[in-house]
Interface confidence: low
């Protein structure tokens, strides 16, 4: 790959696994102020594929909590208001970065990690595979 | 506020920020192989609010390449395969860590950021405002 | 200025119970979500309790579960740990800490209180 210009500023990095050691600053630039998923939306209870919130709380890791969206059912909710099992509640999965403490409780070192989450459910229709 | 008890094997930051600036492994440990979304499953044409990916690239972030959803439809595919406009489209939004580089172009400095992205569509039953 | 004072540590005997508290002043105490940390000795820091802005939700370290019980009054400003059927593994000093900037970085502390459990 090509070598990324160096603007003049940057800083020198001497750690000897550079440039697998970067810097990063922690003072988050957030473009959104509502973090909390239950308060942002009420998607979860109107959906035809209704899914719970369930808080992932780990403190070596940041951000710390993470909510996982689990499917209430395994069908969709119909007009009537009953589940339906014809049609799949299926989840939403967003793969994100997350830092983890390494080693474990250094206060200024981390790793990248990527993990996957569920982030809502969405109503489908099921793949029906015919026996001949 | 008292200092942080460090574990015994943490590296020193000697940066004049610290604590705001902290080191970064960036090999990323990977717990999953799939990374593109439209690979990983086909629930975006399988929905009853299907949705189009659009890909966002960005040389000055981490990752570069962002997948967003954008519902096709304002309304819900029904039984028939028409568009039902008595029930809802609407994107799920996942607040994700990204790092952006900072001073630009710098290769070894970066600042964490928080963006809202669009993951994919649910159907949802919609808000009926009654008027007097 | 903030400040975060804890108190009610002590010697107690396994099996014994202690209330820790935390006066809170300097900030919008119930806007924030609080925690207990410990550190015991010659070991890292570990994260035993956290409790919503509200009351709402309590989250636990597994290793205290069902042993502790994490509680706070926003009119009075005030944290809480109750601490039941205590272990000598719970000697530590027990910290309170509000708004994180990371887990377990948090921009305020107290200065600690020691909980010792003699076996």
């Known amino acids: 790959g090509i070598t990324i210009p160096r603007n003049p500023g940057c800083p020198n990095s001497e750690d000897k696994n550079f440039p697998r050691t970067v810097m990063v600053n922690l003072n988050i630039h957030n473009r959104n102020t509502n973090t909390n998923p239950k308060r942002s939306s009420d998607y979860y209870n109107r959906s035809t594929s209704p899914w719970n919130l369930h808080r992932n709380e780990d403190p070596e890791r940041y951000p710390s909590v993470i909510w996982e969206a689990k499917c209430r059912h395994l069908g969709c909710i119909n007009a009537d208001g009953n589940v339906d099992y014809h049609m799949n509640s299926v989840p939403i999965q967003q793969e994100i970065l997350v830092l983890r403490r390494e080693p474990p409780h250094c206060p200024n070192s981390f790793r990248l990690e990527k993990i996957l989450v569920s982030v809502g459910c969405t109503c489908v229709t099921p793949i029906v595979h015919h026996v001949a | 506020g008292i200092t942080i008890p460090r574990n015994p094997g943490c590296p020193n930051s000697e940066d004049k920020n610290f604590p705001r600036t902290v080191m970064v492994n960036l090999n990323i440990h990977n717990r999953n192989t799939n990374t593109n979304p439209k690979r990983s499953s086909d629930y975006y044409n399988r929905s009853t609010s299907p949705w189009n990916l659009h890909r966002n690239e960005d040389p000055e972030r981490y990752p570069s390449v962002i997948w967003e959803a954008k519902c096709r439809h304002l309304g819900c595919i029904n039984a028939d395969g028409n568009v039902d406009y008595h029930m809802n489209s609407v994107p799920i939004q996942q607040e994700i860590l990204v790092l952006r580089r900072e001073p630009p172009h710098c290769p070894n400095s970066f600042r964490l950021e928080k963006i809202l992205v669009s993951v994919g569509c649910t159907c949802v039953t919609p808000i009926v405002h009654h008027v007097a | 200025e903030v400040q975060l004072v804890e108190s009610g540590g002590g010697l107690v005997q396994r099996g014994g119970s202690l209330r820790l508290s935390c006066a809170a002043s300097?900030?919008?105490?119930?806007?924030?979500?609080m925690y207990w940390v410990r550190q015991a000795p010659g070991k890292g820091l570990e994260w035993v309790a956290s409790i919503e802005q509200d009351g709402s939700e309590e989250y636990y370290v597994d290793s205290v579960k069902g042993r502790f019980t994490i509680s706070r009054d926003n009119a009075k400003k005030s944290l809480f740990l109750q601490m039941n059927s205590l272990r000598a593994e719970d000697t530590a000093v027990y910290y309170c800490?509000?708004?994180?900037?990371?887990?377990?970085?948090?921009?305020?502390w107290g200065q600690g209180t020691l909980v010792t459990v003699s076996s």
């Open positions: 800490a509000k708004g994180e900037i990371l887990p377990l970085y948090f921009d305020y």
């Open positions: 300097g900030f919008t105490f119930s806007s924030y979500r």
